[in-house]
Interface confidence: medium
């Protein structure tokens, strides 16, 4: 009986070993499995972020899209309303004009004298832009760039004066130091009459012959409100 | 449909003044500069100045200032033109034209009333 | 002022020909010119305008060419009502000025 359990004990001891073996495989072979199922998770994890930074990416240059589409269509709708009304309001900006807190500014690509710039402006039934504000001169500046850039402020016939007869005393300024100098020594002839942005968009007076670029302005209608979307 | 129809024929004695008259319809009257040029006989054409109706700025040719007035009545969408000091050499064709698009870089006149005689004799 | 100078004055040509006009400003204008064509007793006709478009209804045999100081104006085969006299003018600040013009003829 002593030989007989024995036996079942070493029988037992197999069927356990095996059992141990095959047990000890499995979890081999479900760890390998798990490697490659976290692998697999991060592949997709990261496959998935990737989507979703392309698909932010895609959804923010669609709001801009549909932003200047929307932009546009409102241009487009208020030279509509414009060309079949009959009033003398200017409610919109024109094509090519950059429209900013009830003003539209024009951007020359070129270069001309001060007074043939002013003129320029005049026969669009607008002025040399006014800078009223340090909000107003970060956009021009934005606009132009490091570029020198006629405005609207001149003293040819004495004290600084704005085109459009906005009081220059008591209004923004943001000349270079020591300037506006009314320099002799370009030997050109005469001082220096007319005021221009800079290159870091600060003003100096200069040549009012010198060819810069300039930027036109022209105010919108107070009374004029956006026309409703079609 | 734009049209510019002008004012009729003109006899005028030197020393005297003429204005001449231009209708504007088919289009926003207020949205378009109005310019005038004159044709001598047999010579070219000649510009003699501007006015932004909307606005009422004009602008004149250096040879003209001071004996030109241009003019507008935004009420009935017509813009004059009177010359003062009239003299023989002032006998010519007189047209106003649409200078098209108010805005951008390039003007030019793309529509022009059918003329208006004016002629300066004693 | 800007100076224009346009040539040649006068010209003799048959129908069919192509025919140029040239047009000399004294000053860089950029694309700010425009052609006109007028015929005897009529108000001048805008064909070209910003240096190179057509004007609407305008035959696409007109064309014209240019930019900064020199212009052209085409006409790449004469019909028989193209006999006029032609104008350029530029828009580079007033005064506008017109060149003196070109006097096509039949040959």
């Known amino acids: 009986q002593n030989s007989q359990l024995q036996e079942e004990l070493r029988g037992l001891r197999e069927t356990f070993s095996n059992f141990t073996a095959s047990t000890e495989a499995q979890v081999k072979g479900l760890s390998t499995q798990g490697g490659n199922v976290g692998r697999k998770m991060k592949s997709l994890e990261s496959q998935l972020e990737k989507q979703q930074k392309d698909l932010s990416e895609d959804h923010s240059s669609l709001l801009l899209h549909v932003k200047q589409f929307v932009s546009d269509l409102r241009s487009l709708s208020c030279q509509m309303a414009a060309l079949q009304g009959n009033g003398s309001e200017r409610t919109c900006c024109p094509v090519n004009w950059v429209e900013h807190e009830r003003s539209c500014y024009w951007f020359s690509r070129s270069g001309k004298a001060w007074a043939d710039a002013d003129n320029y402006c005049r026969l669009e039934d607008a002025h040399l832009v006014v800078v009223t504000s340090w909000e107003e001169q970060k956009f021009v500046q934005h606009h132009i760039g490091p570029v020198n850039t006629w405005m609207g402020l001149h003293d040819q016939n004495g004290p600084w004066k704005w085109v459009d007869g906005t009081d220059y005393e008591t209004g923004f300024k943001n000349w270079r130091p020591e300037q506006p100098d009314d320099w002799y020594g370009h030997g050109l002839g005469g001082g220096e009459d007319c005021a221009h942005f800079t290159d870091d968009g600060r003003w100096n007076d200069d040549v009012c012959q010198r060819p810069y670029r300039w930027v036109c302005e022209t105010e919108l209608d107070k009374a004029s409100q956006e026309p409703p979307l079609l | 449909e734009v049209q510019l129809v002008q004012s009729g024929a003109e006899v005028k004695k030197p020393g005297s003044s003429v204005k001449v008259s231009c209708k504007a319809s088919?289009?926003?009257?207020?949205?378009?500069?109005i310019n005038w040029v004159r044709q001598a006989p047999g010579q070219g054409l000649e510009w003699m100045g501007e006015?932004?109706?909307?606005?009422?700025?004009?602008f004149y040719a250096q040879k003209f200032q001071g004996r030109v007035t241009i003019t507008a009545d935004k009420s009935t969408s017509t813009a004059y033109m009177e010359l003062s000091s009239l003299r023989s050499e002032d006998t010519a064709v007189y047209y106003c034209?649409?200078?098209?698009?108010?805005?951008?870089?390039?003007?030019?006149?793309?529509?022009w009333g059918q003329g208006t005689t004016v002629t300066v004799s004693s | 002022d800007i100076q224009m100078t346009q040539s040649p004055s006068s010209l003799s040509a048959s129908v069919g020909d192509r025919v140029t006009i040239t047009c000399r400003i004294s000053?860089?204008?950029?694309?700010?010119l425009a052609w006109y064509q007028q015929k005897p007793g009529k108000a001048p006709k805008l064909l070209i305008y910003?240096?190179?478009n057509l004007a609407e209804g305008v035959p696409s045999r007109f064309s014209g060419s240019g930019s900064g100081t020199d212009f052209t104006l085409t006409i790449s085969s004469l019909q028989p009502e193209d006999f006029a006299t032609y104008y350029c003018?530029?828009?580079?600040?007033?005064?506008?000025?017109f060149g003196q013009g070109t006097k096509l003829e039949i040959k």
């Open positions: 088919g289009y926003t009257f207020t949205a378009y500069g």
């Open positions: 910003a240096a190179i």
């Open positions: 034209a649409r200078k098209g698009r108010e805005y951008g870089t390039s003007h030019y006149f793309d529509y």
């Open positions: 003018q530029h828009f580079w600040g007033t005064p506008f000025t």
């Open positions: 000053e860089n204008i950029y694309s700010n």
């Open positions: 006015i932004f109706p909307r606005s009422d700025n004009t």
